[in-house]
């Protein structure tokens, strides 16, 4: 076969209708589509092209220059009476760039058959293109069958003599792709058999997803697959001051388009997203997470002078407790609860109050009851202790009322009824409660228990004793009640407002039992135990004995 | 109560350097931003430089930038301007003042002021 | 930097009548909905001190007679009653963008 290499063609003189062609193709120089990179463009190379036509009588070069006198490279070929035609025009070496399927737009005219006179046997209307890979800049010393065939070019649409009259052209746009390409770049090769061809221009390009930010993420360029259907998956990086749960990932499709998003960045706690960048939340805004699409006007009762605030400092006397969001208003301990009123009954005493002015601006208001005794003659006060009840409970009350049971009878209390709320122990400042007094209602008093003998004659005894440990009340009287022992049912009683007595008329050297109860205004109380005293013989002496047992 | 009390002013030559303090108290100092303001005698009032609590972010005037630094001790609860390169035009009345809590802020506290007197 | 004019550069007011202080900044100061504009006063020899802080709201323990309002590039102070105190220069200060800077101040005379 015969060898490719060799002769340039000399340019010749270009015939009329080549001129015209040139004409259309200038207005057909377009930019081309961001996604589309050129490794080829021969309408914009300056200098030679560096092309060879085999053999030189084949292809030629018209050598022309556009309205700004760059030189336009076209290329024609119109040997359409001749027959076997085999004319072959070599591209020099392209380097691929590392793209794996690249894409030839050619821009030609073709001479109808038909409008040739005399040339129909051997006028075609097709040509042929090809390519062959190489690593090397200076490999075009190849045979014809080492190309590999891209496609046969046909036009769509053709010109004849009465085009030319009327000097319309019309331009062939073709585009084909070749791939998977494994070497570092490539000839094209165009072969004529026959036709009346101008190749006005060979675009030779590759397709990119160009680098784009969408999310937040940053996609760098993106060489497209070798395969048509081919996505490839981009990992993309996050912008400044986002972060990520889900690496962001895109596919490049074959087109260089962009499909299939797959996770995202977000800015991070403090930045909010203003035109797919992270800016900085101003002072006076805060943004607590990644997840909260913008920065936020602090709560209310908080303020930040810092830039990037995640949270926001509460005024002074205000709090936050830890389990409360950022973006809650910062808050305080509520006010005192207010008109309290009591009822008492017995030893029991029911409160009652309205909910404070103020809650502090928060909803988990409780109350808590402090008791206090009072001793109301020295005015000191101390803790009730632990046999005071409280119903429903002392601490965290829901409800505005509180029953307290088991108090002392005809005692003085205070009451002191807190308002409290989930930042009252995060505050320094003074407890907020309301007070009441109360006096428990007398009671029946608790037994005597503490008696003493006195004088002891024949026929009488004397005893004193102590006031009950609770007289709850007033003790207006005491009762005595004795009876000689085994005799029962046969009782005396004196009353007595005093602690002391003298039981007369006793009979000597007998045994005598006493029981005492004491009474308030509520009732007597229960009789103490018994006591046993014997009264002298009638010969012994009187005796004055201390505390029986 | 809150108060800033400033101090360090004096006479100057121009070209000398001066550093000015604010003693703060009354308030949680380190969550402020402190601002200094100034006032030439007889003129208005001029912003100077700000600072925020933490130190994060510090901004001038153009007129004192590349000359003058703000800083702050948050351990001392105290403000401080130092002044280099010092200009007749420097001259004034410098007022540290407190960024308010009530957005969007004002400058709701200020010292009662130090003299800086420039010149030679 | 914003530039802030103040007009009128000095006004005499009656006792009891209404003094208006205008301030226009050379670009809006509002963001995000609020205005970032701050009015002080300050009496010969003391410290300024806040009146109006976001254009319209009246800083604690200021009486009710001062008031503000405005948007965007064009703000008010008022004083609907004058009262003998308020004779003072009044100064409008930006605090939305670096620099904060202030209006060059009118000073107010009762008449």
């Known amino acids: 076969p015969a060898s490719l290499a060799g002769c340039y063609s000399a340019p010749r003189r270009a015939p009329l209708w080549t001129c015209l062609l040139l004409c259309a193709a200038l207005r057909t120089l377009l930019a081309s589509p961001s996604n589309e990179v050129n490794l080829l463009d021969s309408r914009t190379v300056m200098g030679d092209l560096g092309w060879i036509a085999f053999p030189k009588n084949g292809w030629e070069e018209i050598g022309e220059v556009d309205e700004n006198y760059a030189p336009i490279h076209t290329y024609q070929v119109c040997k359409v009476m001749e027959q076997n035609q085999n004319n072959w025009l070599l591209t020099s070496w392209i380097s691929n760039e590392g793209a794996s399927r690249i894409f030839i737009e050619l821009k030609f005219t073709l001479r109808d058959c038909n409008s040739l006179p005399g040339g129909l046997g051997t006028c075609k209307e097709t040509f042929n293109m090809y390519y062959f890979e190489s690593d090397d800049q200076n490999g075009r010393n190849i045979k014809e069958n080492q190309y590999i065939k891209i496609d046969t070019i046909a036009a769509d649409e053709s010109f004849t003599e009465l085009d030319l009259g009327d000097r319309v052209m019309k331009l062939n746009t073709e585009v084909r792709d070749v791939g998977p390409l494994s070497k570092k770049g490539f000839y094209l090769a165009f072969q004529d058999v026959g036709a009346c061809i101008a190749l006005v221009s060979v675009r030779v390009y590759y397709k990119k997803c160009p680098s784009v930010v969408r999310h937040l993420a940053v996609f760098p360029d993106t060489i497209t697959g070798a395969d048509s259907s081919q996505l490839l998956e981009v990992s993309g990086s996050c912008v400044n001051h986002s972060v990520t749960d889900e690496p962001p990932k895109m596919h490049c499709s074959a087109e260089g388009e962009w499909l299939v998003p797959i996770g995202k960045c977000m800015c991070k706690a403090g930045y909010e997203e203003k035109n797919g960048t992270c800016q900085v939340c101003r002072p006076g805004f805060f943004k607590a997470s990644p997840h909260i699409q913008s920065c936020g006007k602090c709560p209310p009762h908080s303020y930040t002078h810092e830039e990037a605030s995640t949270s926001c400092v509460c005024e002074k006397d205000y709090f936050r407790r830890e389990s409360d969001p950022p973006t809650m208003a910062c808050t305080r301990p509520p006010s005192a609860p207010r008109n309290a009123i009591s009822n008492v009954n017995e030893t029991s005493v029911f409160l009652e109050w309205i909910p404070p002015a103020d809650t502090g601006g928060r909803k988990d208001v409780s109350y808590y009851i402090a008791c206090k005794k009072c001793n109301s003659h020295a005015g000191v006060c101390e803790e009730c202790g632990g046999h005071v009840r409280y119903l429903p409970r002392q601490s965290g009350l829901k409800n505005t009322s509180v029953m307290m049971v088991d108090l002392l009878a005809h005692t003085n209390y205070t009451f002191e009824i807190e308002a409290v709320n989930g930042v009252s122990d995060l505050s320094p400042g003074a407890r907020q409660y309301v007070s009441v007094n109360v006096t428990t209602n007398q009671a029946a008093p608790s037994p005597v228990t503490n008696v003493k003998k006195g004088k002891i004659a024949k026929n009488s005894i004397s005893l004193s004793w102590q006031e009950p440990d609770r007289p709850n009340g007033i003790i207006l009287e005491y009762e005595i009640k004795y009876f000689e022992k085994d005799q029962e049912t046969s009782y005396t009683i004196i009353k007595s407002k005093e602690t002391t007595i003298t039981a007369e008329g006793l009979k000597p050297a007998s045994v005598y039992v006493f029981q005492i109860r004491a009474r308030t205004a509520a009732g007597y109380g229960v009789f103490s135990r018994r006591f046993e005293f014997e009264t002298t013989p009638v010969f012994a002496a009187s005796s004055d004995q201390s505390q029986i047992p | 109560e809150v108060q800033l009390v400033e101090s360090g002013g004096g006479l100057v030559q121009p070209g000398g350097s001066l550093k000015l303090s604010c003693a703060a108290s009354g308030f949680t100092f380190s969550t402020f931003g402190i601002h200094w303001v100034r006032q030439a005698p007889g003129k208005g009032l001029e912003w100077v430089a700000s600072?925020?609590?933490?130190?994060?972010?510090?901004y001038y005037a153009d007129s004192v930038k590349g000359r003058f630094t703000i800083s702050r001790d948050n351990s001392k609860n105290t403000l401080y301007l130092q002044m280099n390169s010092l200009r007749a035009e420097d001259t004034a009345v410098y007022y540290c003042a407190r960024y308010g809590t009530s957005f969007p802020y004002g400058l709701d506290y200020w010292g009662q002021g130090t003299l800086v007197t420039v010149s030679s | 930097d914003i530039v802030m004019t103040q007009s009128p550069d000095s006004l005499a007011v009656s006792l009891g009548e209404r003094a208006t202080i205008n301030c226009k900044a050379s670009q809006s100061v509002d963001y995000d909905g609020d205005s970032y504009m701050n009015w002080y006063q300050q009496k010969p020899g003391k410290a300024p001190k806040l009146l109006i802080y976001g254009a319209s709201n009246l800083e604690s323990g200021i009486p009710d007679r001062f008031s503000g309002s405005g948007s965007g590039t064009d703000f008010t102070l008022t004083i609907s009653r004058l009262e003998p105190e308020d004779a003072a220069s009044y100064y409008c200060?930006?605090?939305?963008?670096?620099?904060?800077?202030f209006g060059q101040g009118t000073k107010l005379e009762i008449k």
């Open positions: 200060q930006q605090s939305n963008e670096d620099p904060f800077t």
């Open positions: 600072i925020s609590g933490a130190s994060t972010t510090i």
